[in-house]
Interface confidence: low
């Protein structure tokens, strides 16, 4: 891989539409890992610190940005949907963690490394109270 | 899967104000139904994948569409894919 | 935009207590999470205490028993009151707030107390 083509993902989590949660009682957080190169990446969701499964929806495989471009940077989507009491309740703590196999942008390169490092870029919410 | 009552809805959601990206969501429609890759190449558009609560013996559809152009909106992010007009939900402006 | 100021740091000998504000201004009706964290030259940042705007209180092991996290929502302040101070307590406290999305994830420009006899 060409180092100077790597590019840590940014990861940010949009939360539920009060729309979706008073049509349907349900809330659907939204993950989304953009313009990481090359596109090894593990997205995972994070409840009051656990790692949670039910619920969740990743996509299959990193979307190319620029589909064009041969070396094109990737995207990554993932849902986690929460019933709305759930969400609604403002101790709870929801993480989107995307591990990323490659170098931090402030990392150094040295000689003697020889596997990439692991980083960890992370997005949170809080269960959402009323205003 | 099968789905049991489809209830096919686009949900724009809400980032931090310091993000610039829009995120629509197309969720809880039938199994039937493909979505579309947009012809903008500055709207992003993921294939559908299936979700499952299982606490809540509920599955559903899903796919998702996000863009950093400022004149993006959820009415047009699946203008390719066809949905009913009454899918769409507004967004009201949080009163917080 | 929030914007947290800390306060209350200090010189204090082993055995003594100073008490840390922080003060909250801007979307605070946004935030539902308060956390101190500290950083000691040379060492990397690590929790003190949280407390939620449900008022639970979470502590890291070296601060249960003598330190003490609080706030008082009508001042928009949370407290950290630290007794039985220790020369291992010497680092920069920086204040932390989390609103209800990320990355409204919020940091003061810390206050720096020092246990020295």
């Known amino acids: 891989e060409d180092l100077k083509k790597v590019f840590p993902p940014k990861v940010a989590v949009f939360e539920p539409s009060e729309a979706e949660i008073s049509h349907t009682q349900k809330a659907t957080l939204v993950c989304l890992a953009t313009g990481f190169y090359p596109d090894h990446v593990e997205l995972s969701w994070w409840v009051n610190g656990k790692e949670v499964h039910s619920g969740v929806s990743t996509d299959p495989q990193p979307l190319k940005e620029q589909p064009a471009l041969e070396d094109s940077r990737y995207s990554l989507s993932s849902r986690l949907r929460v019933s709305a009491t759930f969400w609604h309740n403002p101790r709870n703590h929801f993480r989107c963690q995307v591990q990323f196999y490659g170098l931090s942008e402030d990392d150094e390169w040295t000689e003697d490394r020889d596997k990439p490092i692991t980083q960890k870029i992370s997005a949170e919410a809080w269960g959402r109270a009323d205003c | 899967p099968y789905i049991q009552n489809p209830d096919p809805a686009v949900y724009q959601l809400r980032g931090s104000k310091s993000n610039d990206t829009s995120v629509c969501l197309f969720t809880d429609f039938d199994s039937v139904m493909n979505v579309s890759q947009s012809k903008d190449s500055d709207v992003h558009i993921t294939d559908k994948t299936v979700l499952d609560m299982r606490s809540m013996d509920f599955k559903s559809n899903g796919a998702v569409a996000w863009s950093n152009k400022s004149d993006f909106a959820c009415t047009s992010a699946f203008k390719d894919s066809v949905i009913p007009a009454d899918t769409f939900f507004p967004s009201p402006e949080s009163s917080c | 935009d929030v914007q947290l100021v800390e306060s209350g740091g200090g010189v204090v000998q082993p055995g003594g207590s100073l008490r840390l504000s922080c003060v909250a201004s801007g979307y605070v009706h946004k935030i539902n999470f308060y956390g101190w964290y500290r950083q000691a030259p040379g060492k990397e940042r690590e929790k003190v205490a949280h407390i939620s705007i449900g008022d639970q209180t979470d502590y890291a092991d070296s601060a249960k028993g003598r330190f003490t996290i609080s706030r008082d929502e009508s001042k928009n302040t949370v407290y950290l009151q630290m007794n039985s101070l220790r020369p291992e307590d010497t680092a920069t406290y920086y204040c932390?707030?989390?609103?209800?999305?990320?990355?409204?994830?919020?940091w003061g420009q810390g206050t720096l107390v020092t246990v020295s006899s």
């Open positions: 932390r707030a989390l609103s209800r999305i990320w990355p409204y994830d919020y």
